[in-house]
């Protein structure tokens, strides 16, 4: 109930866990041998630091933050990861031609710290 209790980034604008978009070609992704389309993907991913209580996904993330402050060498800080995903459809090569395939965990929709 007390998760995600901070959306203000103490490190400055854009430094904390948030959604980033990177334009990538099939070649960049290593998909050119099995994906035909789209030829370019706006890849949304979660990047940034997870300082104290920032977008904590759950109580475990809050505990992790507290313990990281006490024992930074043994307890890592929470990581910035997708909270939800956007599905995406790809046109793929198959043995018999081409087909559509959907992926429900390919693009991040929003982010949190866990």
């Amino acid at each position: 109930a007390r998760a995600r209790n901070g959306d203000h980034c103490p490190l400055g604008p854009g430094r904390c866990c948030r959604l980033h978009t990177v334009r990538a070609s099939l070649e960049d992704l290593g998909w050119a041998d099995w994906v035909l389309s789209p030829r370019e993907v706006q890849v949304t991913m979660c990047i940034g630091a997870c300082p104290s209580q920032f977008r904590a996904a759950n109580m475990h993330a809050q505990i992790k933050t507290s313990l990281h402050r006490l024992k930074p060498d043994t307890v890592p800080a929470p990581c910035c990861v997708p909270a939800r995903y956007n599905p995406m459809v790809l046109i793929q090569k198959t043995d018999t031609g081409v087909s559509l395939q959907t992926y429900d965990d390919l693009l991040a929709k929003d982010c949190h710290c866990i």
Partner: antibody, heavy 119, light 110 residues
């Protein structure tokens, strides 16, 4: 402004051929897939197939495979739906629609082309 | 018959809240997204909700979408006369690719 403009209504006889068009403007035509959707009189929407206008890759719904042909001419930003031999049961409104950036939904639609097949 | 099941019709008085259901299975709604389209009489469909609960710009916040398990719902609050239309849900099915519900006719009572 994104627009999909379809060709006008057609009245044909059974056995005749037909090619209807869908011209895209206001966006990069080769960057978005185009789908075709059928709506028979008083009925719901049926997905027919999709084309990637950039690579001309086409995939058809199993229900429409072999019944129609989807193509595109990227030089004039136009997608096509064609029949080689029309049947009375092809009478319907046909819509072209642009896929959103994830390929999972249709974000812009053409105004529709009414095809009537009657002897 | 459609892969996704919608009630043929729903109705409500102006100002009321109505919901339209869309029932699927574990091979479509159960694992993926749902999109909703509005088709006003005599016009082309228009995207209303995408990826379960997202509204495209220009769509009033009176329209909202949700998904639970193998079913999805479209809710319309503060019903207005101009909301009278056909509403279609759409998803993905592993065997048929893009699938639509049969459509629901919304009547706004006079």
């Amino acid at each position: 402004e994104v627009q999909l403009v379809q060709s006008g209504a057609e009245v044909k006889k059974p056995g005749e051929s037909l090619k209807i068009s869908c011209k895209g403007s206001g966006y990069s035509f080769t960057s978005y897939w185009i789908g075709w959707v059928r709506q028979m009189p008083g009925k719901g929407l049926e997905w027919m197939g999709v084309i990637d206008p950039g690579g001309s890759y086409t995939i058809y719904s199993p229900s429409f495979q072999g019944q129609v042909t989807i193509s595109a001419d990227k030089s004039i930003s136009t997608a096509y739906l064609q029949w080689s031999s029309l049947k009375a049961s092809d009478t319907a409104m046909y819509y072209c629609a642009r896929y959103g950036r994830y390929g999972t939904y249709f974000d812009y639609w053409g105004q529709g082309t009414l095809v009537t097949v009657s002897s | 018959q459609s892969v996704l099941t919608q009630p043929p019709s729903v109705s409500g008085a102006p100002g009321q809240r109505v919901t339209i259901s869309c029932s699927g299975s574990s091979s479509n709604i159960g694992v993926l997204y749902v999109n909703w389209y509005q088709q006003l009489p005599g016009t082309a469909p228009k995207l209303l909700i995408y990826s379960n609960d997202n509204r495209p710009s220009g769509v009033p916040d009176r329209f909202s979408g949700s998904k639970s398990g193998t079913s999805a719902s479209l809710a319309i609050t503060g019903l207005q006369a101009e909301d009278e239309a056909d509403y279609y849900c759409q998803s993905w099915d592993s065997s048929s690719n893009y699938v639509f519900g049969g459509g629901t006719k919304l009547t706004v009572l006079g």
